[in-house]
């Protein structure tokens, strides 16, 4: 596919990435799908600088990011290595809490109202952040 050289209209550019911040709420899987349909992915936070950037643009409300452990280990949706990467969990999180009564534990990560991360039930309808990188090949087929 062709390389994306500029951000989609009305997205916010920062450090060669483009960001869109939802104001409605969706379950994690629906938010993930929404971003994919925009040729993007749920935000992957790779540094303290990016953490602060996102935090400054979102409201002080629970907001999904592209991090989950639905298949066992924690994974970023774009393949960024979790173990060696940036983390900003709240104290004693993630805890895979089962006491919510909704069945299962907590497999999806979100920004809390103070920006730090928590794991929660993936079905909760939270806001989300989409991210797409500039200079990466888009998923669109090339024009013939």
């Amino acid at each position: 596919g062709s390389e994306r050289t500029c951000c989609p209209v009305n997205w916010v550019e920062h450090e060669r990435s483009c960001y869109w911040f939802s104001r409605s709420g969706k379950a994690w899987a629906d938010a993930d799908n929404y971003c994919r349909l925009e040729d993007a992915h749920l935000v992957v936070v790779t540094s303290w600088e990016e953490q602060k950037f996102v935090q400054h643009h979102i409201g002080p409300v629970n907001t999904w990011m592209g991090l989950h452990d639905q298949n066992g280990p924690w994974k970023w949706v774009d393949g960024t290595d979790y173990e060696t990467g940036f983390k900003n969990w709240r104290p004693e999180q993630p805890d895979d809490w089962y006491g919510h009564g909704l069945g299962g534990g907590e497999d999806c990560a979100h920004f809390t109202d103070d920006g730090r991360w928590n794991d929660d039930v993936c079905q909760r309808p939270y806001r989300w952040v989409c991210e797409t990188e500039l200079d990466k090949a888009s998923q669109e087929p090339p024009l013939l």
Partner: antibody, heavy 124, light 112 residues
Framework: QVQVQQWGAGLLKPSETLSLTCAVY????????WSWIRQPPGKGLEWIGE???????NYNPSLKSRVTISVDTSKNQFSLKLSSVTAADTAVYYC??????????????????WGQGTTVTVSS | DIVMTQSPLSLPVTPGEPASISCRSS???????????LDWYLQKPGRSPQLLIY???NRASGVPERFSGSGSGTDFTLKISRVEAEDVGVYYC?????????FGGGTKVEIK
């Protein structure tokens, strides 16, 4: 200069559905979220909900079960439907421009464009 | 929901004199980005509301310099340095920090 014009039925009977439309002229409809706000006679302002051109909505929980906000991007219009109205829904209804489409809090500049208001009366 | 409380309810003013309206929120409106998410609107008699101040202290386009907003966290103030006859109406504060957006009950400014 961006302008918004709104219209809809002004007199309803209890249990009917309120229906209003707001049209945006002279500015980029797709650049913003758009809100509905209402004001009962002699009272203050109440936010009803918001929508963007993609159809993403956010509703006031106090009205959520009865409210639908929809969009027609081809006409630069968005609409409000409120079902099962009662006398308590009698109010002036306004549409207004608000957050940028990006959703970014850093680019919020207030509700800076308002419609002229539509008076809706619910009476049997 | 965030509760917004305005005072006074009514404010009789003399043209040329200053006026001040208070607004308090039930929780802090200060965002980690440094902005206070508090707007001020004026609704003149028979008209739609109009934006005066956004993000606590920023005057909207075309708003006279006699209007100023201040405050942080939960306590905010709208000041009119010298009231003019055209300033009469109901003033509302509003928080856009969290949905649902919520408004104060309004302060009616009238000429003595």
């Amino acid at each position: 200069q961006v302008q918004v014009q709104q219209w809809g039925a002004g007199l309803l009977k209890p249990s009917e559905t309120l229906s209003l439309t707001c049209a945006v002229y002279g500015g980029s409809f797709t650049d913003y979220y758009w809100s509905w706000i209402r004001q009962p006679p002699g009272k203050g302002l109440e936010w009803i909900g918001e929508i963007n051109h993609s159809g993403d909505t956010n509703y006031n929980p106090s009205l959520k079960s009865r409210v639908t906000i929809s969009v027609d991007t081809s006409k630069n219009q968005f609409s409000l439907k409120l079902s099962s109205v009662t006398a308590a829904d009698t109010a002036v209804y306004y549409c207004a421009r608000e957050f940028p489409y990006s959703g970014s809090y850093l680019y919020y500049y207030g509700m800076d464009v308002w419609g002229q208001g539509t008076t809706v009366t619910v009476s049997s | 929901d965030i509760v917004m409380t305005q005072s006074p309810l009514s404010l009789p003013v003399t043209p040329g004199e200053p006026a001040s309206i208070s607004c308090r929120s039930s929780q802090s409106l200060l965002h980690s980005n440094g902005h206070n998410y508090l707007d001020w609107y004026l609704q003149k008699p028979g008209r739609s509301p109009q934006l005066l101040i956004y993000l606590g202290s920023n005057r909207a386009s075309g708003v006279p310099e006699r209007f100023s907003g201040s405050g942080s966290g939960t306590d905010f103030t709208l000041k009119i340095s010298r009231v003019e006859a055209e300033d009469v109406g109901v003033y509302y504060c509003m928080q856009p920090l969290q949905t649902p957006f919520t408004f104060g009950g309004g302060t009616k400014v009238e000429i003595k």
